[in-house]
Amino acid sequence: DAHKSEVAHRFKDLGEENFKALVLIAFAQYLQQCPFEDHVKLVNEVTEFAKTCVADESAENCDKSLHTLFGDKLCTVATLRETYGEMADCCAKQEPERNECFLQHKDDNPNLPRLVRPEVDVMCTAFHDNEETFLKKYLYEIARRHPYFYAPELLFFAKRYKAAFTECCQAADKAACLLPKLDELRDEGKASSAKQRLKCASLQKFGERAFKAWAVARLSQRFPKAEFAEVSKLVTDLTKVHTECCHGDLLECADDRADLAKYICENQDSISSKLKECCEKPLLEKSHCIAEVENDEMPADLPSLAADFVESKDVCKNYAEAKDVFLGMFLYEYARRHPDYSVVLLLRLAKTYETTLEKCCAAADPHECYAKVFDEFKPLVEEPQNLIKQNCELFEQLGEYKFQNALLVRYTKKVPQVSTPTLVEVSRNLGKVGSKCCKHPEAKRMPCAEDYLSVVLNQLCVLHEKTPVSDRVTKCCTESLVNRRPCFSALEVDETYVPKEFNAETFTFHADICTLSEKERQIKKQTALVELVKHKPKATKEQLKAVMDDFAAFVEKCCKADDKETCFAEEGKKLVAASQAALGL
């Protein structure tokens, strides 16, 4: 349904508040270095223009595409060349190439200062003084640091952020009320950003079909009572929403997401019995709730899959004539029966099934060739099951911090060329799989763990893509989306790696470590651990443990000393010498 003015259409659909918020997010995700005030000015100009188009859709420029309007606006930024360098060249291009160019310059690891949380009283004052600016600033700071954050979901986070301040700034103990809420929002926000980043990587690097396959599997697990045609419709709509958001079309994305939520709620009887509560909520909460809704119960007495996908005489004919439909049906039927499998495992099974049909269907006796295809699934299922079992046992034995350290050592030995901050960040996140998933019963462990690991490994992939240093990382990241985790798991110690030169400066610590939070102190120690492994990749677990124990004792001792700085200087030298001796450096 074509509209005379796209900008007027979206303004009317979304309302002024959401329109302004989404334009701010879009601009901050594109121009990540621009000051807040500049973005607010641009957003106000776009909003005023949109209002003129609402009043008269035939007004000048109102018929232009949103990409043209927004791109033209971004290209008016005076400091574009000096702030963004070659990104300014995008402005010389025509749409749609200009928007593609802006997308390519999105930076997953922008050089921005860490967000420091002010005192609670300072935040509450700022919130009361100018609530609108305070909330816009939140959108801006999150969007510029997370250029692929799912925009309609960020509106939901902003709503919760506002609610936290509204409630807690009136509380007797503001800090006790507010800080846990802000911590929760921060942690959920990081997780949400990472999950969306995987969706965008899936679409951008592996194409629409890969995303659709993921969506078929996930929605079939979630809505096992829904018919295949219903799941297919939801997949098509969901793909459109995420394609738009990942492509920077945030107004269309938010609008289409609202339409999808409306459709799901109007048709919940044929989708899932678990949607009732979600559908009673306001729009932003409703969409979030639907996205997180628990799996519905599996229909009773589902027939064996073998009848349609192995025993039927029409298997090859159906496959050859419409692979997407036939393999989609296979994936749907398998996924709805297996909420206990990860999505990536289901996709591996579907790929194995497809490969077998492709190999067998032209053979003299196709059925004999593919009759045992389901037997090929057994090792594919057992591999993640065994890996999760082993790692959960290790996690339960070590606890989160030491489990992270085990992963740090493991991954540094696999891909030592990767930067230390990236290895620390990724391994810490990989280690969180323990507390996140190992508490679950067997039936929920694999979907929790392996799908979470896919999200974390995608962080490694996008960070590595910016400055590639390891062929092994590139290979695991680009060859197959669903086999990334098995690919990294299969990597052994990189025997080609030339150990890093020893640099005492890397292992010199100061009294400031004593004032750090427990988390920051862990990161310092883990950074040192990665550097140790890079210097001595052949160091044994026992050697590394001894050095890390000595290091922990050294920090504890010096933080208790009267003259901390002297202690760190003198004891630090001794520690470095002892560590060198212990590791044979």
């Epitope: 194409g207 629409e208 079909r209 090859c316 004919k317 496959y319 050859a320 004539e321 419409a322 692979k323 997407d324 439909v325 049909l357 492709e358 190999k359 067998c360 269907c361 032209a362 053979a363 003299a364 006796d365 196709p366």
Partner: antibody, heavy 121, light 110 residues
Framework: EVQLLESGGGLVQPGGSLRLSCAVS????????INWVRQAPGKGLEWIGI???????FYATWAKGRFTISRDNSKNTVYLQMNSLRAEDTAVYYC???????????????WGQGTLVTVSS | DIQMTQSPSSVSASVGDRVTITCQSS???????LSWYQQKPGKAPKLLIY???KLTSGVPSRFSGSGSGTDFTLTISSLQPEDFATYYC???????????FGGGTKVEIK
């Protein structure tokens, strides 16, 4: 040495029929999928259809109804029956084997030398 | 409707030149079901590359293929006298009935 050899081409009047043969030597045809591909003079390649080892056939949308592929494994030969021929069917017709291990992919590793079919009054 | 667009339709080049031929498909081909063929006048086509980037046995390493989804490229890194020919891409889709070839690219001597 594996060879595919097409025959049966020639001049045919519009509306007429023709049956082309593809004789295979050096391999047992019963294990392979064979395609028919044509090329109009000075033009590009156009896929007509395929017959799997099991005898199952598939055709390009435009070829359905007028063209039929069959095989006789005892003679190690595949056939292309063409009916209601038109001037635009004038082309060199090739048979080609699909790379073993693929069923629906456009990977044709062994080709005949082609046979010319001319449809003209 | 399936469209397989090859460009350029012809290219003049000298021995030793690097030649790049592109193939654009709409919709995207089925998981890298893309091949490249070489055809010389009066001869049958010869399969060079399958699965977008895999070289058929016996094909010189100066030939390489890349791409995925909708956009594919055949590159001849250093053109040899025997490489002057017409090149075709072939695509496989969700339905086998949609199997299609590109329009061809003639590589001529400059």
């Amino acid at each position: 040495e594996v060879q595919l050899l097409e025959s049966g081409g020639g001049l045919v009047q519009p509306g007429g029929s023709l049956r082309l043969s593809c004789a295979v030597s050096g391999i047992d045809l019963s294990n392979y999928a064979i395609n028919w591909v044509r090329q109009a003079p000075g033009k590009g390649l156009e896929w007509i259809g395929i017959i799997w080892a099991s005898g199952t056939t598939f055709y390009a949308t435009w070829a359905k109804g007028r063209f039929t592929i069959s095989r006789d494994n005892s003679k190690n030969t595949v056939y292309l029956q063409m009916n209601s021929l038109r001037a635009e069917d004038t082309a060199v017709y090739y048979c080609a084997r699909t790379v073993p291990g693929y069923s629906t992919a456009p990977y044709f590793d062994l080709w005949g030398q082609g046979t010319l079919v001319t449809v003209s009054s | 409707d399936i469209q397989m667009t090859q460009s350029p339709s012809s290219v003049s080049a000298s021995v030793g030149d690097r030649v790049t031929i592109t193939c654009q498909s709409s919709p995207s081909v089925w998981f890298n079901f893309l091949s490249w063929y070489q055809q010389k006048p009066g001869k049958a086509p010869k399969l060079l590359i399958y699965e977008a980037s895999k070289l058929t046995s016996g094909v010189p390493s100066r030939f390489s293929g890349s791409g995925s989804g909708t956009d594919f490229t055949l590159t001849i890194s250093s053109l040899q006298p025997e490489d002057f020919a017409t090149y075709y891409c072939g695509g496989g889709y969700s339905s086998i009935s949609d199997t299609t070839f590109g329009g061809g690219t003639k590589v001529e001597i400059k």
